[in-house]
């Protein structure tokens, strides 16, 4: 008879057997028997197996081309697959990073709002008024108008999201 | 609680018999094999028998085999070992180990043992 | 039958101690290997299945390791509860077979 309440957690059904799954970071040879336990066998170079399992074959590492921008970050186990990040200046252009875009820069009239990393692109944001911006930049946030008052000036032409203000002297009235 | 508890143990003469008995409780008594396993004074611990959930499966090792033969009553939540034809050797604390499993009383490993009853085999 | 061979067969040690004992197998296992903890008088514990899977409550400074014929149980920071006698077993193969124990003792 099957039993009662099928097979324990790490444990597979099969032949009326309650197996052994094989540990993470090992391959399946052969089911149990009712005198034998699983036969498991760790997997190769560059492969892995990240769960209890039953596989016939474990799987490749994933390879960080760097003809696509790609670098490792972490180095695969047994255990676990390598992580791939971007070279300085890419990102990755999905969440499996299988190929990086190069940062988006910040036109001017738009400032960065979060500097990019390996995993996301750069975020800009317009320019406020009271800020600008005059440069394409990946990394150069808005900066504040200049205080013409401050420096006993007066605003000769006024500020723009892409341009500072122009101080200039105050009139002095002549006798 | 979870626990085993093993009964029936003490002295008796070479050449007879003695029945040990355990006690599941706390947990689902016929969703496991069960199994015993001894140790003689100073010596390792020993296998002796495992029967599966439903009794379908029933091992014995070497040394025991036609001696000894293991049962459960899972209305009873119980095992048990009759041990005949009993040996100055078979003297040990007998444990009654619950195997993670349900299907085999072959292989296994033992995740709840109870304290053990000592048999004593001598004239 | 599968033999099991544990050493050293007693270890003295201190609180605090790192403390390694290990089993070798006459034929490969695979990773089908636990260790037990016994105190006198007390039933056995199960502290590891599987060579290196820590049973449920069991303190992480009990660890194991190996596979194929060669299995370490490392306490990495000795405890006062932690003096017992310790065995392996194997559950490869018919019949489950153990090691013979270590004691690990007060020094």
């Known amino acids: 008879p099957e039993p009662p309440t099928a097979c324990r957690e790490k444990q597979y059904l099969i032949n009326s057997q309650c197996c052994s799954l094989c540990q993470p970071g090992q391959k399946l040879v052969s089911d149990c028997t009712e005198f034998t336990e699983t036969e498991c066998l760790p997997c190769g170079e560059s492969e892995f197996l990240d769960t209890w399992n039953r596989e016939t074959h474990c799987h490749q590492h994933k390879y960080c081309d760097p003809n696509l921008g790609l670098r490792v970050q972490q180095k695969g186990t047994s255990e676990t697959d390598t992580i791939c990040t971007c070279e300085e200046g890419w990102h990755c252009t999905s969440e499996a990073c299988e190929s990086c875009v190069l940062h988006r820069s910040c036109s001017p009239g738009f400032g960065v709002k979060q500097i990019a990393t390996g995993v996301s692109d750069t975020i800009c944001e317009p320019c406020p008024v009271g800020f600008f911006s005059n440069v394409s930049s990946a990394f150069e946030k808005c900066h504040p108008w200049t205080s013409c008052e401050t420096k006993d000036l007066v605003v000769q032409q006024a500020g723009t999201n892409k341009t500072d203000v122009v101080c200039g002297p105050q009139d002095r009235l002549r006798a | 609680e979870v626990q085993l508890v093993e009964s029936g143990g003490g002295l008796v003469q070479p050449g007879r018999s003695l029945r040990l008995s355990c006690a599941a409780s706390g947990f689902t008594f016929d969703d496991y094999a069960m199994h015993w396993v001894r140790q003689a004074p100073g010596k390792c611990l020993e296998w002796v028998s495992g029967i599966s959930w439903s009794s379908d499966s029933i091992h014995y090792a070497d040394s025991v085999k036609g001696r000894f033969t293991i049962s459960r009553d899972n209305a009873k939540n119980s095992l048990y070992l009759q041990m005949n034809s009993l040996r100055a050797e078979d003297t040990a604390v007998y444990y009654c180990?619950?195997?993670?499993?349900?299907?085999?009383?072959?292989?296994?490993?033992?995740?709840?043992w109870g304290r053990g009853t000592l048999v004593t085999v001598s004239s | 039958d599968i033999q099991m061979t544990q050493s050293p067969s007693s270890v003295s040690a201190s609180v605090g101690d790192r403390v390694t004992i290990t089993c070798r197998a006459s034929?490969?296992?695979?990773?089908?290997l636990a260790w037990y903890q016994q105190k006198p008088g007390k039933a056995p514990k199960l502290l590891i299945y599987a060579a290196s899977y820590l049973e449920s409550g069991v303190p992480s400074r009990f660890s194991g390791s190996g596979s194929g014929t060669d299995f370490t149980l490392t306490i990495s920071s000795l405890q006062p509860e932690d003096f017992a006698t310790y065995y392996c077993?194997?559950?490869?193969?018919?019949?489950?077979?153990f090691g013979c124990g270590t004691k690990v003792e007060i020094k």
């Open positions: 180990a619950k195997d993670p499993t349900a299907t085999t009383g072959a292989r296994g490993y033992f995740d709840l």
């Open positions: 077993q194997q559950h490869s193969s018919f019949p489950p077979t």
């Open positions: 034929k490969v296992i695979s990773s089908w």
